[in-house]
Interface confidence: medium
């Protein structure tokens, strides 16, 4: 008996060939011997089966001895053994129809779980294997679960259902709702304008929700809400903003925040959350601000950084065009009685400069002694 696998909603063609390449009598019946379709004279006739409105045949191939049955808009319950009667012989074809669907919305938040459920005919024992757009492999039986979705799981999943050494393929598009980056750090000199950007890793026709940026300044004992906003059809409107600092927010996506000045008291970490309409849970992106200040006070030249820096970062004071350098894996470096000239303060990671500030040290002339 030939086995044919079909996909729910698809069209399948069950073939039946006569030995003589000519138009002859044929009938297709189901396992209950109910006639589905056949030929009477030169016309296609349909029987009383449930399939009658979805079954057809390729009339153009009849005179070549091909008497196929086409079933449109397949349903799981179409799974059955179909019998083609032609030239006093019977050909049996077992049709197994499968459906694979995500058991929830296919737009899921990062960290949420995805479950794919296989609909299959009674008595079948299929296996399912799926591959994510990033190459992650999973396999299962009636259900396949991905416990924690990551942003690289966004895209088309390829799933193969196998039964009796036959396979049928499914493609399922999954959208993982997340920011493009989990975390980002902005490095600024004191007084510079700061731009924070929060691009999304997905696009939706209508994007509605609300968000908030909580900030934990390094110098503060507790965090505070810097800004709250609404998102309506990709338009951003500010609801509430602190007086210090006075953040500005762009009206369009990607979410964009401007801090007029980088100051040591603002250095720290923030967490932007975005709650989307009709979705449980929130999207998160961490953002860090590191601020540098270079100062000269009397005979002391100091360079300091504030904010979340990793212990492997190096802070250096360097005299331009000279070898004089002071380097430390610390948040402050200083030089006593610095030579006159242009000094550079550098924050670097394995030789890559992240932040640089220049300060000019003027020569100090000895004060003339009063007679």
């Amino acid at each position: 008996k030939k086995v044919v696998l079909g996909k729910k909603g698809d069209t399948v063609e069950l073939t039946c060939n006569a030995s003589q390449k000519k138009n002859t009598q044929f009938h297709w019946k189901n396992s209950n011997q109910i006639k589905i379709l056949g030929i009477q004279g030169l016309f296609l006739t349909k029987g009383p089966s449930k399939l009658s409105d979805r079954a057809d045949s390729r009339k153009s191939l009849w005179d070549q001895g091909c008497f196929s049955m086409i079933i449109k808009n397949l349903k799981i319950e179409d799974s059955d053994t179909y019998i083609c009667e032609v030239e006093n012989k019977k050909e049996e074809v077992e049709l197994l129809v499968f459906g694979l669907t995500a058991n929830s919305d296919t737009h899921l938040l990062e960290g949420q779980s995805l479950t794919l459920t296989l609909e299959s005919p009674p008595g079948s024992s299929p296996s399912v294997k799926c591959r994510s757009p990033g190459g992650k492999n999973i396999q299962g039986g009636r259900t396949i679960s991905v416990p924690q979705l990551e942003r690289q799981d966004s895209g088309t999943w390829t799933c193969t259902v196998s039964q009796d050494q036959k396979t049928v393929e499914f493609k399922i598009d999954i959208v993982v709702l997340a920011f493009q980056k989990a975390s980002s750090t902005v490095y600024k000199k004191e007084g510079e304008q700061v731009e924070f950007s929060f691009p999304l890793a997905f696009t939706l026709e209508k994007l509605t929700g609300s968000g908030e940026l909580w900030w934990q300044a390094e110098r503060a004992s507790s965090s505070k809400s810097w800004i709250t906003f609404d998102l309506k059809n990709k338009e951003v409107s500010v609801k509430r903003v602190t007086q210090d600092p006075k953040l500005q927010m762009g009206k369009k996506l990607p979410l964009h925040l401007t801090l007029p000045q980088a100051l040591p008291q603002y250095a720290g970490s923030g967490n932007l959350t975005l709650a989307l309409e009709a979705k449980t849970g929130k999207l998160h992106q961490e953002v860090n601000l590191v601020v540098m200040r270079a100062t000269q006070f009397q005979e002391n030249l100091t360079c300091e950084v504030w904010g979340p820096t990793s212990p492997k970062l190096t802070l250096s004071l360097k005299l331009e065009n000279k070898g004089a350098t002071v380097s430390k894996q610390a948040k402050a470096v200083w030089v006593l009685n610095p030579e006159a000239g242009m000094w550079q303060c550098l924050l670097s990671d394995s030789g890559q400069v992240l932040l640089e500030s220049n300060i000019k040290v003027v020569p100090t002339w000895p004060t003339p002694v009063q007679p």
Epitope: K129, G134, G135, N137, Q139, Q152, S162, K166, T167, E169
Partner: antibody, heavy 117, light 107 residues
């Protein structure tokens, strides 16, 4: 019996184009990814990329993206690896393999490509 | 890309010896690791999948273990036909990558 049969050895000049093939039999060709692996003379195995013959979806290793094209013709259960302009450094043995959940469970016999002026 | 590092690069052993080859991934790959055997002028052959599952038809003297970043292939009692080059491969995320190989030679 699952089999992957590759086309024969090729000797080409630099700048020439080439398309080698891999014909699958004994299994549902459209239901498995097919991968290509390079082995340069005396060296190890390098994963080049894969194709899903069901709909010709491809994924390349960044090292080979833009250097080769992987394609398939499901009507004849055949996958292809092609170059538009060969270089001497493309001289290698190329294997196709059936990808079963990422594991290469069945391999072709290999196609030796020699590029020399 | 995930880097796969095999050690040793080459190994001399005698028939009957117990041999262990290790493979380290640059990041966690769960159990998505395969081992292959390749003999000169032949295509590689799959030995182990999912870090520890034996491919059908492969002798039981071959075994695999490990998960996360550290994996081993063990041959409990070397046979003459086992002298070959062995490769590990991760298939946790694209691009799937191979180790550089371990050549097992007769002492």
């Amino acid at each position: 019996e699952v089999q992957l049969v590759q086309s024969g050895a090729e000797v080409k000049k630099p700048g020439e184009s080439l398309k080698i093939s891999c014909k699958g039999s004994g299994y549902s060709f459209t239901g498995y990814w097919i991968g290509w692996v390079r082995q340069m003379p005396g060296k190890g195995l390098e994963w080049m990329g894969i194709i899903y013959p069901g709909d010709s979806d491809t994924t390349y290793s960044p090292s080979f993206q833009g250097q080769v094209t992987i394609s398939a013709d499901k009507s004849i259960s055949t996958a292809y690896l092609q170059w538009s302009s060969l270089k001497a450094s493309d001289t290698a043995m190329y294997y196709c393999a059936r990808d079963q959940l990422g594991l290469f469970d069945y391999w072709g016999q290999g196609t030796l490509v020699t590029v020399s002026s | 890309d995930i880097q796969m590092t095999q050690s040793p690069s080459s190994l001399s052993a005698s028939v009957g010896d117990r041999v262990t080859i290790t493979c380290r991934a640059s990041q966690g790959i769960s159990s998505w690791l395969a081992w292959y055997q390749q003999k000169p002028e032949k295509a590689p052959k799959s030995l182990i999948y999912s870090a520890s599952s034996l491919q059908s038809g492969v002798p039981s003297r071959f075994s695999g273990s490990g998960s996360g970043t550290d994996f081993t292939l063990t041959i409990s009692s070397l046979q003459p036909e086992d002298f070959a080059t062995y490769y590990c491969q991760q298939y946790d995320s694209y691009p799937y990558t191979f180790g550089q190989g371990t050549k097992l030679e007769i002492k």
